[in-house]
Each structure stands twice: as structure tokens, then as C-alpha cells.
Interface confidence: low
């Protein structure tokens, strides 16, 4: 058995056992999504660890239960993000809002999608059910990081600029007038994808397929694996989570929270001034008149804000913690226990990954009635079953009676909810 | 080539202590989990204790937990096993037996050993 | 504990499998040991299943699954004869275990 033996993978039988080999050696397990190598000694003995150290004890059950759990959120995820993405494409309705936000919004549920097509179908199969060996080649595994690096890139800086966009919007609408216009929005948008594409650099670089068969020869012992040392590769873990966690997150809990308290101060006077509020920074302000409904929605602003926040950090947060887990865990203090615990913490932090992917087009969509009555139509345009089932429109309402002495009135309170 | 040297057996007391070490050369004895395996008089191979690379984790044989220690010495390439409350059933031939990389310990995973020290416990 | 047989003969020539069955398990590793006399040093010819270090001639072969792993030797030499231990792990103990061994005999 393998004291310092795991996982992009999945769990380990249950424990009884305490020294259950490890998944994958930390090999996989930490590999996948992310990576990891088996830790300590694992660079002076890459082609001499034998090749059942890199099988992965994981009952059928447990197999079983991940795939069904990975296809749901699969299915959901992909037709959330491509109905968002084709709704955005094609709605002339929402393009012409003066807000830029639909082009955050398609650029999200591109990144999304990316994430659920390149990633998840691959870590099914070759982390979860065929642990090795690596079966897409040396190009497919220095790809495979690189794709889904850059896609987690874009995710959370797509998060991170919808915040941005959003406090623009809400906070400064005057200032959001001529920063964001289309031509802007559209580089900035491109500045990120650029961005995270060069950020996912180091992966192309970082990861290769090696053979750990006991004679580096064995076809069943290769393996995507770290080929650098790893005190490089712990850097190159620290980098991506503070570029693709820690920054985003700081980044969308300030802006929400200035939101929120933004958004709440509207509500407040709306109720003390006879539903009028102000909107505006500090140099130029103007008032609107906000039927009784909008303050609710304005309410439910505040709480979907929040539930983005929670959400980023829910989903992300365990995934990036399993991963710095081999930066700062040393080679004697992984314990059987702690292999225990970290092939189901594995499984755990991975679900949550795509169930971030999966979420995104309701957290940022379908909260808006408005979208959400253009997303069912859409949907019911693709989907002929959909479209019988739906007799008549699931949502309607009445359009804003959102009066003012400015233009960006009903766009600063209509998009508020994204 | 690995080299794995025994001493420390002998004629020993029921009751005593025995320490048994092992020197290694021939490898990065850092990099290597490190194994003890007895033999008994006209008997089979039995387990004794293991220890991985850094030394902070050991692993012991249940006929010998609780009495059993052993440790290593990177600087020195050694391995020592320290036994306790000696019996007559502990005589064996003992072999110091090298793990097969930094995560192996068990009887499954052991490939290369050393030629043993022999230790006869009698009153 | 590990089970073997405890002898087998082999033709000069021939094959032989030796198989270890019982509370160990594939997943943490079989090995296979070789001593020509009680009391020697014993010479790994398998380990972790299906290795073979790069000083055995490749007529030794391992396989495993399950709870059962198999030692293959094909084109039995004279010099072959030995006892056969396997070693593995028994998650009821957390222990290491070895198997009682089996005497290969070449006729």
C-alpha cells in the first residue's frame, strides 16, 4: 500500500482501513481538475513507481454515484449555458439595453460551457473511471490543463467583470455611459480571454505524459502528470488561485457589497420618500419614481447579490483549498487518515467546480423575469417537447413603469438583478 | 548496486533489549520507505515493522507492537529496529529489506534485501 | 493470512503458477520472493503485483486480481528451485503479511 500515494479522482472505499492506498497516488488526485504530484519524493522516482500505485480505489458505487451526479450537472450545465448563449446571440431585445451587461453575460456561459465540454467528459472518464493509463496523448494531456485552466480563468474573471460592470451600472451610471460602451465592452471582454489564455501558459509547460511503469516501458503506466519540479509546480498552484480565486473573489465581494448596500439604501427610500429613489455617485444624482412591486425586486437584488458571492465561494473555495492542500502539506504529514479524507474532500471539491458552471446562467439569468421569459421562449424554440408542454407563457409581467428625468433610469434598475 | 548490511544479533537474554541496525549504501536512502522481515527457525517470512522516508511514520506487526521501535537516520543511511521485553519466540534470522520507493511499506512492496542478522533469545 | 500451496513441480522447460489467495488484496500490492535455502537472503523476483526488478530474467511473470495474485514461471530452469513466499497487506490487521510459502521442485 502507498503511504504517499491521488486524484483528479474520486473517493476511496470507506475507512475502516486507515491506510487505504492512496487515489492515484496524490498523483491523480491532486492532478485532477488541478493537479498535483505524488508528494515528496515523486520527481526522483518518476519512472519508478509501479503502475498499480496509479490505480484509484473507488468501489462502483462510489463510481457510479460521481458519473451520475457529473451527467446531471452536465446536462443542466450545458443546456443552461448554451439557451443563455443562443438567447444573448439572438434576442434583439436584450441587445438593445443600453447596459452592456449581455455581453458578460454570453461571455460567461462561454466559459461555462468550455468548462463543462473540454473538462468534465475527460476527467469522467480517464480520473474516475480509467485512472491510467493517460489515453489522449502527450499533446492532449499539456492541452487538456492548459483548456481547462484557461476556461477556469475565464469563469472567474468573467464573475469578477460582471461585478465590475454591475457596480458601473448601479453605483456610477454616469461614468458607466462612456466607459462602457459596446466597442469597450467588447476589448475588455477580449482582454480577458487573452488574459486567461496567457495565464494558462504555464500548464502547456507544467504537465506532460509520463510512463510510471517500474520500467518506464509498460503502455499501462502512462500517466498526465506534473513533469517540472515540484516546488515549481507549487508555484504555479499558488498563482492560479490567487489569479483565479483570491483576486475574483475579493474583487466580487467588495462591488457586491457596495451593491447590496447600494440597492438596500434604494429600498429605504423608496419606502421613507413615496417609492422615489436616487441613483447616482457623488458629483451628479437623479431621482426616479419606483412602483411598489420594483421594491421587492430591488430586495431580491440584494439577495441575489449575496447569493452570487456565497456561491463563488462555496463552489471555488473547497477546490482551491484541495489543491493548496499539497503546497503546504508536507510528505509526513499525510497520514492514512488524511488520504482518507482527502479522496472524498476530492470528489467533493470537484462536484462543486462544475456545479459553479452549472449554476452561473441562474444565478446571473434566469433571476431576471425579463430574461427568464426570453430564455423559455428560447428554449421552447429549440426544445419541440418543451414547447408542448408550455401551453401558455410560465412568466409574464407588466413592462417597468419606471418614470425619469434621465435615460439610464430603467436601465439602472432593470439590470440591477443581472 | 543496493547493499543492505545487518548487525546487532546474537545470544540474547528473554526480558532484554536488542537493537538491530541496518546500513545501506547503493541508493538515495532518503527516497526509500525501509522494511524489517523475520524468519524463524524452519518457518516462513513474517512482516516486522516498517518506516517511511522522512521518519515520522512507522508501521508495526501486531506480535510486536507496543514493544517493537524502529527509526532511521537519513544522514547515516540507517535503519535500526529496537526490540523490547524479549522472548523466546522472537529468535528469527532478521532482514533489513528496502521498500520499493517512498510510498510502499507492506510485504507486497519490498525489492531488495539485506542477508540478515540472526538472533537466538535463550535463558 | 495469505494462502499458497505448499509445494508445486515444474517439467525442466515448463511453466509454473503459483498463486497466493486470502485477506490480501490487488489494490495494495502483491510481491514475490524467492530463497534458495531457510535462513538466506530471499531475492525479490515480483513486486507490487506485476513488476519485475531489472535483475530477474523475464520468464518471471505476476499477475493479480482480487484477493488472488499469480507467480508464472515459464521455461523452468534448475536453478529456479526455491521456496516461493508472496507478500502482501491484510486490511483486518493493517499489517503486512507474507504467505507460508511454496516449495517449486524441477523435475
Known amino acids: 500500500m502507498r503511504l504517499n500515494s491521488s486524484a483528479p479522482g474520486t473517493p476511496g472505499t470507506p475507512a475502516a482501513d486507515p491506510f487505504q492506498r492512496a487515489q492515484a497516488g496524490l498523483e491523480e488526485a491532486l492532478l485532477a481538475p488541478g493537479f498535483g504530484n505524488a508528494s515528496g519524493n515523486a520527481s526522483e522516482r518518476v519512472l519508478a513507481a509501479p503502475s498499480s500505485e496509479l490505480d484509484v480505489n473507488t468501489d462502483i458505487y462510489s463510481k457510479v454515484l460521481v458519473t451520475a451526479v457529473y451527467l446531471a450537472l452536465f446536462v443542466v450545465g450545458t443546456v443552461g449555458n448554451t439557451v443563455t448563449a443562443f438567447t444573448l446571440a439572438r434576442k434583439k431585445s436584450l441587445q438593445s439595453l443600453q447596459s452592456t451587461v449581455h455581453y458578460h453575460l454570453g461571455s460567461l456561459a462561454l466559459s461555462d460551457l468550455l468548462t463543462l465540454l473540454l473538462a468534465m467528459p475527460v476527467e469522467l472518464y480517464n480520473f474516475i473511471w480509467v485512472h491510467h493509463p493517460w489515453a489522449f496523448g502527450d499533446a492532449g494531456c499539456r492541452g487538456y490543463y492548459f483548456l481547462r485552466d484557461a476556461c477556469t480563468y475565464a469563469t472567474a474573471l468573467n464573475v469578477a467583470s460582471l461585478s465590475v460592470e454591475r457596480y458601473l451600472a448601479i453605483c456610477h451610471p454616469f461614468k458607466a455611459k462612456t466607459l462602457m460602451s459596446r466597442s469597450r465592452t467588447k476589448k475588455f471582454i477580449s482582454a480577458i480571454w487573452l488574459a486567461s489564455a496567457l495565464l494558462a501558459v504555464p500548464m502547456l509547460f507544467t504537465m506532460g505524459e509520463q510512463n510510471r511503469s517500474a520500467d518506464g516501458q509498460h503502455a499501462g503506466g502512462l500517466v498526465c502528470t506534473p513533469t517540472i519540479h515540484t516546488a515549481t509546480v507549487k508555484v504555479v498552484i499558488q498563482v492560479n488561485t490567487f489569479m483565479s480565486f483570491i483576486f475574483p473573489m475579493v474583487v466580487i465581494s467588495v462591488l457586491n457589497t457596495i451593491i447590496a448596500n447600494k440597492l438596500t439604501v434604494m429600498v429605504r427610500q423608496a419606502a421613507e420618500q413615496g417609492q422615489v429613489c436616487t441613483v447616482g455617485g457623488e458629483h451628479s444624482t437623479f431621482s426616479m419614481a419606483i412602483e411598489p412591486g420594483r421594491v421587492q425586486a430591488l430586495r431580491h437584488g440584494v439577495r441575489v447579490l449575496r447569493a452570487v458571492v456565497i456561491a463563488f465561494v462555496v463552489c471555488w473555495l473547497p477546490y482551491h483549498v484541495r489543491r493548496l492542500m499539497f503546497c503546504y502539506i508536507s510528505d509526513e504529514q499525510w497520514t492514512p487518515f488524511l488520504y482518507d479524507f482527502y479522496h472524498y474532500f476530492y470528489m467533493v471539491t470537484n462536484a462543486l467546480f462544475y456545479v459553479s458552471s452549472t449554476i452561473n446562467p441562474i444565478l446571473y439569468n434566469l433571476v431576471s423575469a425579463n430574461f427568464r421569459h426570453i430564455f423559455l421562449a428560447t428554449l421552447a424554440c429549440l426544445c419541440p417537447v418543451w414547447r408542448r408542454r408550455r401551453k401558455r407563457p410560465a412568466f409574464s409581467r407588466k413592462a417597468d413603469s419606471v418614470s425619469s428625468n434621465h435615460t439610464l433610469s430603467s436601465n439602472a434598475t432593470r439590470e440591477t438583478l443581472y | 548496486a543496493v547493499t543492505l548490511d545487518e548487525s546487532g544479533g546474537g545470544l540474547q537474554t528473554p526480558g532484554r533489549a536488542l537493537s538491530l541496525v541496518c546500513k545501506a549504501s547503493g541508493f538515495t536512502f532518503s527516497s526509500f520507505n525501509m522494511i524489517w522481515v523475520r524468519q524463524t527457525p524452519g518457518k516462513g517470512l513474517e512482516w516486522v515493522a516498517s518506516i517511511c522516508t522522512g521518519g515520522s511514520y512507522t508501521y508495526y506487526a501486531p506480535a510486536v507492537k507496543g514493544r517493537a521501535t524502529i527509526s532511521r537516520d537519513n544522514g547515516q543511511s540507517t535503519v535500526r529496529l529496537q526490540l523490547n521485553n524479549l522472548r523466546a519466540e522472537d529468535t528469527a534470522t532478521y532482514f533489513c529489506?528496502?521498500?520499493?520507493?517512498?510510498?510502499?511499506?507492506?510485504?507486497?512492496?519490498?525489492?531488495?534485501w539485506g542477508h540478515g542478522t540472526e538472533v537466538i533469545v535463550s535463558s | 493470512a495469505l494462502t499458497q500451496p505448499s509445494s508445486v513441480s515444474a517439467n525442466l522447460g515448463g511453466t509454473v503458477k503459483i498463486t497466493c489467495s486470502g485477506s490480501g488484496s490487488s489494490w495494495h500490492g502483491y510481491g514475490w520472493y524467492q530463497q534458495k535455502a531457510p535462513g538466506s537472503a530471499p531475492v525479490t523476483v515480483i513486486?507490487?503485483?506485476?513488476n519485475r526488478p531489472s535483475n530477474i530474467p523475464s520468464r518471471f511473470s505476476g499477475s493479480a486480481s482480487g484477493s488472488t495474485a499469480t507467480l508464472t514461471i515459464t521455461g523452468v530452469r534448475a536453478e529456479d528451485e526455491a521456496v516461493y513466499f508472496c507478500?502482501?497487506?491484510?486490511?483486518?490487521?493493517?499489517?503486512?503479511?507474507f504467505g507460508a510459502g511454496t516449495t517449486l521442485t524441477v523435475l
Open positions: 529489506a528496502k521498500s520499493v520507493d517512498g510510498v510502499g511499506w507492506h510485504a507486497g512492496q519490498i525489492d531488495a
Open positions: 507478500g502482501g497487506y491484510d486490511s483486518s490487521t493493517y499489517a503486512g503479511i
Open positions: 513486486y507490487d503485483n506485476t
